[in-house]
Interface confidence: low
């Protein structure tokens, strides 16, 4: 026989086929082998100019031989090589669909492969590929659009070697709150990590605001205002400093009394305060917490306490806001200057969490009076809030 | 004096139950989260369950979710560890940890440990 | 989760050595971070908390310093009593993970 060719290969399939003898013959006899694979060899009848070659091996070069013969006498052995495709990876499947995230599972090929090409497209056209090792058979996806349909492709690759491609569809999952007003709707969104977030206020996406949400504090979802951790922090500062806030959202820092009364103002909040000092905490709830706005000073509402820090706060409730160069209180002297800090003074504290960060001196450093005194500057406290119904929205939420 | 006296560990079989049990006394217990760390032979510490004051928030090793339980009475001052579909892999000596706040953060206090053997 | 590197595993050193331990987080954890020292048959003990706070009745060769992501316990003047297993600990989020541990033993 002559021409001896290969066609329609693929993974585990090829067809040989070949120019017949000149002479008739009684049959041809073909074999083939592959590295690590045994030698095959069958008999086809003398009429037969192709053969279907079956269960092979994916990604393997196979050498294909085959000869005539006619009673005893056997014609030359004429010789063809190819190469089996790459089997395609299996049973690609998208698990944990959340709104910005999913899973990619999948099986491995036969072959052995050098990586695996993955490629999601969502509907508008968005495309993104990554190349992922040979060990690997899962991939999360992350940055996905909520409510967006992607198709997820997945191709394995040996080398210059690639195989067919495979997909799964899939659609992440809405978010509740496309703009949420605060950290307890970004919660509620599925983030539960504590870190800064956007929020927008009254859900409207042109008021954007950067804030540090701890999503983990007795049950998480508040909006973190004051954090007061290390003293790097100037906190003697002006009215101005204090409407617009000051300092690093992941350190010290006061988010502002304008932000303040944005956010009290989209409904009924709750603040919680954290306090720490050498391996003893105390925090204190009040479940109406509220801020007015620049006309009124930043008039503070704060009632319904629980909590184990003691209920200082009540001392200020109803004051305005008070700062060095714009006093509000009701001390003759100022208390911003007397007490090197700012708050909703009376006459003059109870707490002065904007006080001055180490400082013992009576009244001077950070107090919670009911639970260090004014005698002693606590180390570490968070002022925080969130709405008073988040309670309701979170079991609203886990029963969806 | 504050203490923690963890009881109800022992030898069960792979696939098995068995409830931990935490008494502590010396401080007022609702005011504080509580944990449960384990440490297996030879091995380093490892972070297994922890549950608010309240009781109200629960948070779980991804190694026992689903599996375990944690629980608290504060009545009686008493902390829980249900463990279903024991493996091989939670022989451990379990500890009951004191927080130092009503959430998850640091473990001021610890009992002396309970063992729990799982064999077939 | 946070994963939580400390260097070294071991740690022979002679009495009234200096001792350093540093201990990595995989991600940004502020400060909020402990270290416990246990002994042999013994529970695990509170020493620093927050990176760099003493625990009340521990003593003052102890120290703790770092934030972020590095930290670092020192051990002023190693005393006998002190040699035992010491544990790094991120708090910062759940679930709380530990360091593999240090090892501080007689040089």
């Known amino acids: 026989p002559s021409g001896l060719v290969t066609a329609n290969i693929t993974d585990s399939e090829a067809l040989a086929r070949w120019q017949p003898a000149i002479a008739t013959v009684d049959s041809y006899v073909i074999s083939y082998t592959g590295e690590k694979v045994p030698e095959i060899t069958r008999t086809v009848s003398g009429n037969t100019v192709e053969y279907a070659l079956t269960d092979l091996e994916p990604a393997t070069e196979y050498t294909l031989r085959i000869f005539a013969e006619k009673g005893p006498q056997k014609s030359s052995t004429i010789t063809a090589k190819f190469t089996t495709d790459l089997d395609s990876p299996r049973d690609l499947t998208a698990t944990e669909v959340q709104s910005e995230t999913a899973l990619l599972t999948w099986r491995p090929p036969r072959a052995s492969v050098t990586g695996y090409l993955l490629v999601y497209e969502s509907v508008d056209g968005t495309v993104k590929e990554v190349i992922v090792g040979p060990d690997t058979t899962s991939y999360s996806l992350a940055d996905l659009s909520p409510s967006t349909h992607y198709t997820a492709k997945i191709q394995a690759l040996n080398g210059p070697l690639r195989s067919n491609m495979i997909q799964t569809i899939f659609t992440t999952i809405g978010l509740l709150y496309p703009f949420p007003k605060d950290c307890s709707q970004a919660m509620l969104n599925g983030d539960t990590t504590s870190g800064l977030y956007t929020i927008y206020l009254n859900g409207d996406k042109a008021e954007a605001l950067e804030v540090f949400c701890d999503m983990t504090s007795d049950g998480g979802g508040w909006i973190v205002f004051l954090r007061r951790k290390n003293g790097r922090e100037n906190f003697y500062q002006n009215w101005k400093a204090y409407a617009a806030g000051f300092g690093d959202r992941r350190e010290e820092f006061w988010l502002g009394l304008d932000n303040l009364n944005k956010i009290t103002a989209q409904g009924q909040y709750e603040l919680r305060v954290d306090l720490r000092d050498h391996g003893e905490t105390a925090f204190a709830v009040y479940d109406k917490f509220s801020v007015g706005d620049a006309k009124t000073r930043y008039k503070l509402k704060v009632e319904g306490y629980s909590g184990t820090a003691g209920d200082s706060m009540a001392y200020h409730n109803g004051r305005s806001f008070s700062t060095f160069d714009k006093d509000t209180d009701s001390a003759i002297t100022n208390c911003a200057l007397s007490y090197k800090g700012a708050f909703w003074y009376r006459n003059c504290h109870r707490v002065n969490l904007m006080g001055r960060y180490g400082d013992n001196n009576h009244s001077q450093g950070v107090n919670w009076f009911h639970w260090k005194g004014h005698e002693h500057s606590i180390q570490f406290a968070e002022m925080k809030l969130r709405p008073s119904n988040f309670r309701n929205l979170e079991g609203r939420r886990k029963r969806a | 004096q504050v203490q923690l006296v963890e009881s109800g560990g022992g030898l069960v079989q792979p696939g098995r139950s068995l409830r931990l049990s935490c008494a502590a006394s010396g401080f007022t217990f609702d005011d504080y989260a509580m944990h449960w760390v384990r440490q297996a032979p030879g091995k380093g510490l490892e972070w297994v369950s922890g549950?608010?004051?309240?009781?109200?928030?629960?948070y779980y090793a991804d190694s026992v979710k689903g599996r375990f339980t944690i629980s608290r009475d504060n009545a009686k001052n008493s902390l829980y560890l249900q463990m279903n579909s024991l493996r091989a892999e939670d022989t451990a000596l379990y500890y009951c940890?004191?927080?130092?706040?009503?959430?998850?953060?640091?473990?001021?206090?610890w009992g002396q440990g309970t063992m729990v053997t799982v064999s077939s | 989760d946070i994963q939580m590197t400390q260097s070294p595993a071991s740690l022979p050193t002679p009495v009234g050595d200096r001792v350093t331990i540093t201990c990595r987080a995989s991600q940004y954890i502020q400060g909020f971070l402990n270290w416990y020292q246990q002994k042999p048959g013994k529970a695990p003990k509170l020493l620093i908390y927050?990176?760099?706070n003493l625990e009340t009745g521990v003593p003052s060769r102890f120290s703790g310093s770092g934030s972020g992501t590095d930290f670092t316990l020192t051990i002023s003047s190693l005393q006998p009593e002190d040699f035992a297993t010491y544990y790094c600990q991120q708090s910062y989020s759940t679930p709380q993970t530990f360091g593999q541990g240090t090892k501080v033993d007689i040089k």
């Open positions: 940890a004191k927080d130092i706040s009503a959430v998850p953060d640091t473990f001021d206090i």
């Open positions: 927050d990176a760099s």
């Open positions: 549950i608010s004051g309240s009781g109200g928030s629960t």
